[in-house]
């Protein structure tokens, strides 16, 4: 899997999107997890609704939210009030039984707030994305979902 880099500004919201094949992953719940070390486990942060038909309902764990457009095949994670300690490697996963398929590997980079005039020396600045050989950078704009953008699955 290539690693996609999403950059956000400290104190703002960052939206991460993970596209997937909606037919291949039909009926599967999704999750967002944080990679603990290069070879370590991926620790679950938040998962989509327990009832797959209600995957469009946003689920929160602390400042992290997840919602799934099961028809369009896009998992969306929102990190609210982004902090330097949120920087790191994450995964979007598709769950089936006790197994999990990786939909996308994500590197979250936290940039200093340009309007924050405090000493930025203790803020974590991400390294150049080139340090990830096959990394792809996505500059994610910070905004809330608009009313009409809340995704819905089909029902049976």
């Amino acid at each position: 899997h290539n690693t996609t880099v999403f950059q956000g500004v400290a104190g703002q919201s960052l939206q991460v999107s993970c596209p997937y094949d909606s037919m291949k992953h039909w009926g599967r719940r999704k999750a967002w997890c944080r990679q603990l070390g290069e070879k370590g486990p991926c620790q679950r942060v938040v998962s989509t609704h327990n009832l797959w038909l209600l995957s469009f309902l946003r689920r929160w764990n602390g400042s992290t939210a997840i919602t799934d457009d099961t028809l369009g095949g896009t998992l969306t994670i929102t990190l609210r009030n982004l902090q330097p300690h949120d920087a790191g490697l994450y995964q979007c996963q598709s769950l089936h039984g006790s197994e999990a398929d990786t939909l996308r590997k994500v590197l979250v980079e936290v940039l200093a707030d340009p309007l924050d005039h405090r000493d930025a020396g203790d803020l974590w600045f991400p390294g150049e994305s080139e340090s990830f050989e096959d990394a792809h950078v996505e500059h994610s704009i910070s905004r809330s979902l608009l009313e009409g953008e809340i995704p819905f699955p089909p029902t049976s």
């Epitope: 609704h49 009832l51 469009f56 919602t67 979902l145 809340i150 029902t155």
Partner: antibody
């Protein structure tokens, strides 16, 4: 701001059907789930079923399966709940509710009283 | 079907007092629990979702807690407008179910 406006009160005979409408304004109608909940006089709330307008298909509570039909008309931003083979126990206030983002019941209509009496 | 049992059925309190309402599920619903307030002649209003998150515009005196099978809605200091019926609701399993309600009345 989301608003749900329901049709007026109905009086029906046992064995007949009733169709209640719920018109939505604010936001994009096709992007929200609409649920129907009923409340018999002095009783609690009971989920009947719901529909995701963009897919046009509904999900029903087992208790009402075969007797209730929930539909939506995107062109008029209106959802409908039709209940057939009415009996006196169906006398209740019927509410439509729609999701904003957190639950299926973030916003509610004002309710429609359906009285079933011979 | 998951049965939600609310207690007490009626709670008689005075304005300014603390109200503690309970909702118990017949099996675990994780944190998939919401609380609603309903006043006579009105539609219910969402107060709390995901067991402990306040909905937009809900005063800080309302708080929710619990997970699994036992949940609590607390109103820290009752205002005159808080006297109403409160319902819990789960959507962890089909069908979606509501509790029988707790009426908070003026003592």
């Amino acid at each position: 701001q989301v608003q749900l406006v329901q049709s007026g009160a109905e009086v029906k005979k046992p064995g007949s059907s009733v169709k209640v409408s719920c018109k939505a304004s604010g936001g994009t109608f096709s992007s929200y789930a609409i649920s129907w909940v009923r409340q018999a006089p002095g009783q609690g709330l009971e989920w009947m079923g719901g529909i995701i307008p963009i897919s046009g298909t509904a999900n029903y509570a087992q208790k009402f399966q075969g007797r209730v039909t929930i539909t939506a008309d995107e062109s008029t931003s209106t959802a409908y709940m039709e209940l057939s083979s009415l009996r006196s126990e169906d006398t209740a206030v019927y509410y439509c509710a729609r999701t904003q983002e957190y639950t299926l019941f973030d916003s509610w209509g004002q309710g429609t009283l359906v009285t079933v009496s011979s | 079907e998951i049965v939600l049992t609310q207690s007490p059925a009626t709670l008689s309190l005075s304005p300014g007092e603390r109200a503690t309402l309970s909702c118990r599920a017949s099996q675990s619903v994780s944190s998939y629990l919401a609380w609603f307030q309903q006043k006579p002649g009105q539609a219910p209003r969402l107060l709390i979702y995901d067991a402990s998150n306040r909905a937009t515009g809900i005063p800080a005196r309302f708080s929710g807690s619990g997970s699994g099978t036992d949940f609590t809605l607390t109103i820290s200091s009752l205002e005159p407008e808080d006297f109403a019926v409160y319902y819990c609701q789960q959507d962890y399993h089909w069908p979606i179910t509501f509790g029988g309600g707790t009426k908070v009345e003026i003592k």
